[in-house]
């Protein structure tokens, strides 16, 4: 028969900094050998070469050395491409072209996404506030993609739409920083919430500020960090926010700033003697030197790893001193599950089959749910195992044993409990003798 090249109909959603698999499969004829195979991945629009396999050999990446095939799976018809450290610029359509004797191609879309950080809220003016004063509340959320939707509401959940100005600016990596400004007249007290939504990830990041007029300042060095854990995706950069209140006339020469791991007290990064003393943590940390004088002691942690998860203490000493701890919660999304069936040929009603649902490289451990075509949960005869690789990421394999009816759909949902991200796969088995896999 003809060479059939298959790719997913839906776009592959990949998080910036993570690896993505662009799935592509073909149907090899009996007796097929890799010496016969020509495989080309290219950008659909510009036809720029991305990766190729020819003359029985992987010819390598022509795309910034960030692509790889799965050489051990090629002979079985798996022509998928692994794209490492995804960037915003990678978004678009990739064509998988396979030529043996016959040839065929199909295009798969890559949709890039990056979650927005928990918004930081600033108030202007922020001192001696009284009912009736007009204040400007700025909600800032960073390093997301694509552009965000921003919503404001009051303490009762009523939307605030008037006097809102939102701007979004892309940085050199193409990630957006969003700044939304709300101007309000203060009541006796009030809570103002800002919600930043990533339309692709359907991820909401929110923060609120409660303004109680007539707060008295303490005069002490006040070190402030976010109450909620900072959620960072493996491979991306994270900002551990920390701010302090500099006194008038404060100079950086007076500042001692130390970031350390809360539990072990291991030094992470420091600033003293008027100078950034650099990273003591695998050279993956940086301060924001231009912002220190304004009281911004935040720490940038690059290429986040699972092992980074935990509590970091920000210690500020000028004349007075203070500290606060911020938690880093590491996460990695699970891949779209792949489904396998055993046995996978000549299936008939009454046969017992084993359906395996596999999802890869997520963190933390996943929750796995099975259900039938009517959405009824399947809990009996399910065995789930999760194994961490050397980077601490989990591969999850869940096995369901079922007796086939006349026909049936079996769905597997792999949930990341931190990202509240669901990845699902399903298989439909029809009653007449059939061969797996059908297209899900």
């Amino acid at each position: 028969g003809a060479l059939e090249v298959q790719v997913p109909e839906d776009p592959v959603v990949a998080l910036v900094g993570t690896d993505a698999t662009l799935c592509c499969s073909f149907s090899p004829e009996p007796g097929f050998s890799l010496a016969q195979l020509n495989l080309i991945w290219q950008l659909t629009d510009t036809k720029q070469l991305v990766h190729s396999f020819a003359e029985g050999q992987d010819q390598g990446s022509a795309y910034a050395n960030r692509t790889a095939l799965f050489p051990d799976l090629l002979a079985q018809g798996n022509a998928s491409l692994r794209l490492q450290r995804v960037r915003v610029a990678d978004e678009g359509s990739f064509t998988c072209f396979v030529s043996i004797r016959d040839f065929g191609s199909a295009a798969v879309s890559l949709q890039v996404a990056a979650p927005y950080s928990k918004p930081s809220m600033t108030l202007e003016p922020n001192k001696d506030l009284r009912p009736g004063d007009t204040v400007t509340i700025t909600c800032s959320s960073y390093q997301g993609y694509p552009e965000a939707e921003v919503f404001w509401q009051d303490g009762q959940g009523v939307p605030l739409t008037g006097n809102v100005t939102t701007s979004q600016m892309a940085n050199e990596q193409g990630l957006f920083d969003v700044h939304s400004i709300l101007r309000v007249v203060l009541g006796a007290n009030g809570t103002y919430s800002c919600l930043v939504r990533n339309p692709v990830l359907q991820q909401d990041a929110h923060s609120s500020v409660t303004i109680t007029p007539q707060r008295s300042p303490t005069g002490a060095v006040e070190v402030q960090v976010p109450e909620d854990p900072v959620v960072a995706l493996v491979g991306t950069d994270a900002t551990l926010r920390c701010s302090f209140s500099p006194e008038p006339g404060f100079s950086l020469a007076q500042l001692n700033l130390i970031w350390q791991l809360t539990d072990t007290k291991q030094l992470v990064h420091s600033f003293t003697e008027g100078r950034d003393q650099g990273s003591a943590y695998a050279n993956r940390t940086a301060l924001f030197p231009d912002l220190l004088a304004q009281g911004n002691a935040s720490l940038r942690l690059q290429r986040v790893r699972v092992a980074d998860e935990g509590s970091f203490t920000c210690f500020v000493s000028i004349r007075d001193f203070g500290s606060a701890a911020v938690s880093l919660q590491v996460a990695a999304p699970y891949s779209k599950p792949s489904m396998t069936l055993e046995p996978n040929k000549d299936l008939r009603p009454g046969d017992t089959v084993t359906i395996t649902c596999s999802s890869y490289r997520g963190y933390p451990e996943a929750e796995v749910f099975w259900q039938d075509g009517q959405g009824v949960p399947l809990t009996g005869n399910v065995t789930t195992s999760q194994m961490a690789n050397e980077q601490g990421l989990f591969d999850v394999h869940s096995v369901l044993r079922v007796v086939l009816g006349a026909n049936g759909t079996y769905s597997c949902l792999v949930r990341n409990p931190v990202l509240q991200q669901d990845a699902h796969g399903s298989v439909t088995i029809t009653g007449q003798p059939m061969t797996f896999p059908p297209e899900a």
């Epitope: 002490a220 060095v221 030094l267 003293t272 000493s317 004349r319 007075d320 203070g322 500290s323």
Partner: antibody, heavy 116, light 108 residues
Framework: GASVVESGGGLVQPGGSLKLSCAAS????????MSWVRQTPDKRLELVAT????????YYPDSLKGRFTISRDNAKNTLYLQMSSLKSEDTAIYYC??????????WGQGTLVTVS | DILLTQSPASLSVSVGETVTITCRAS??????LAWYHQKQGKSPQLLVY???NLADGVPSRFSGSGSGTQYSLKISSLQSEDFGSYYC??????????FGGGTKLEIK
């Protein structure tokens, strides 16, 4: 001039509790971090607790965490150290000292705590 | 915690001589180091802060130097009131800010 005066020391049995006080005068106490430092019979100095100017942040060596509590009352210009589950190795002269960022300037004359 | 090692532990010298006491830190303390003098039966008195700065009222025969992990206190032309014990203390990082073991200076 500036001075700090410790009080509350004395003889206590093992397992007992004691609360030390330190009265400050002659400087703006409410803007200074403060520490309790002890000097053991072998003359070694050990910082046992530190508190920042508004009392929000407190620090202890891991070995003493849970047994000692430092606190302050800025309205009264007074620093406190609550000690519980005392052991013989807590026998020392306890000094109250300022901890202004990178310098320790004002020290008291000390109060003797004997656990026996 | 950072360990401060003082040397020598004791020394015996005559009035008018010059002595140097050293303090080695187990890691860089970035000049956040103080020196104290303690006379028998008295509380410690601050001599030097941030490694090189003399505290108010301290005679100029005392001088502090050093950086990184190595620091020293030099006393030129020793006077009788200079005898007693000397301690270093760092103020780097999150407390506890530890002390050196002390140096006992005796009259020969």
């Amino acid at each position: 001039g500036a001075s700090v005066v410790e009080s509350g020391g004395g003889l206590v049995q093992p397992g007992g509790s004691l609360k030390l006080s330190c009265a400050a005068s002659g400087f703006t106490f409410s803007t200074f971090g403060m520490s309790w430092v002890r000097q053991t019979p072998d003359k070694r100095l050990e910082l046992v607790a530190t508190i920042n100017s508004d009392g929000v942040n407190t620090y202890y060596p891991d070995s003493l965490k849970g047994r000692f509590t430092i606190s302050r009352d800025n309205a009264k210009n007074t620093l406190y150290l609550q000690m519980s589950s005392l052991k013989s190795e807590d026998t020392a002269i306890y000094y109250c000292a300022s901890a202004e960022g990178r310098r320790g300037a004002y020290w008291g004359q000390g109060t003797l705590v004997t656990v026996s | 915690d950072i360990l401060l090692t003082q040397s020598p532990a004791s020394l015996s010298v005559s009035v008018g001589e010059t002595v140097t006491i050293t303090c080695r830190a187990s890691e860089n303390v970035y000049s956040n180091l103080a020196w104290y003098h303690q006379k028998q039966g008295k509380s410690p008195q601050l001599l030097v802060y941030t490694a090189t700065n003399l505290a108010d009222g301290v005679p100029s025969r005392f001088s502090g130097s050093g950086s990184g992990t190595q620091y020293s206190l030099k006393i030129s032309s020793l006077q009788s009131e200079d005898f007693g014990s000397y301690y270093c203390q760092h103020f780097w990082g999150i407390p506890p800010w530890t002390f050196g073991g002390g140096t006992k200076l005796e009259i020969k």
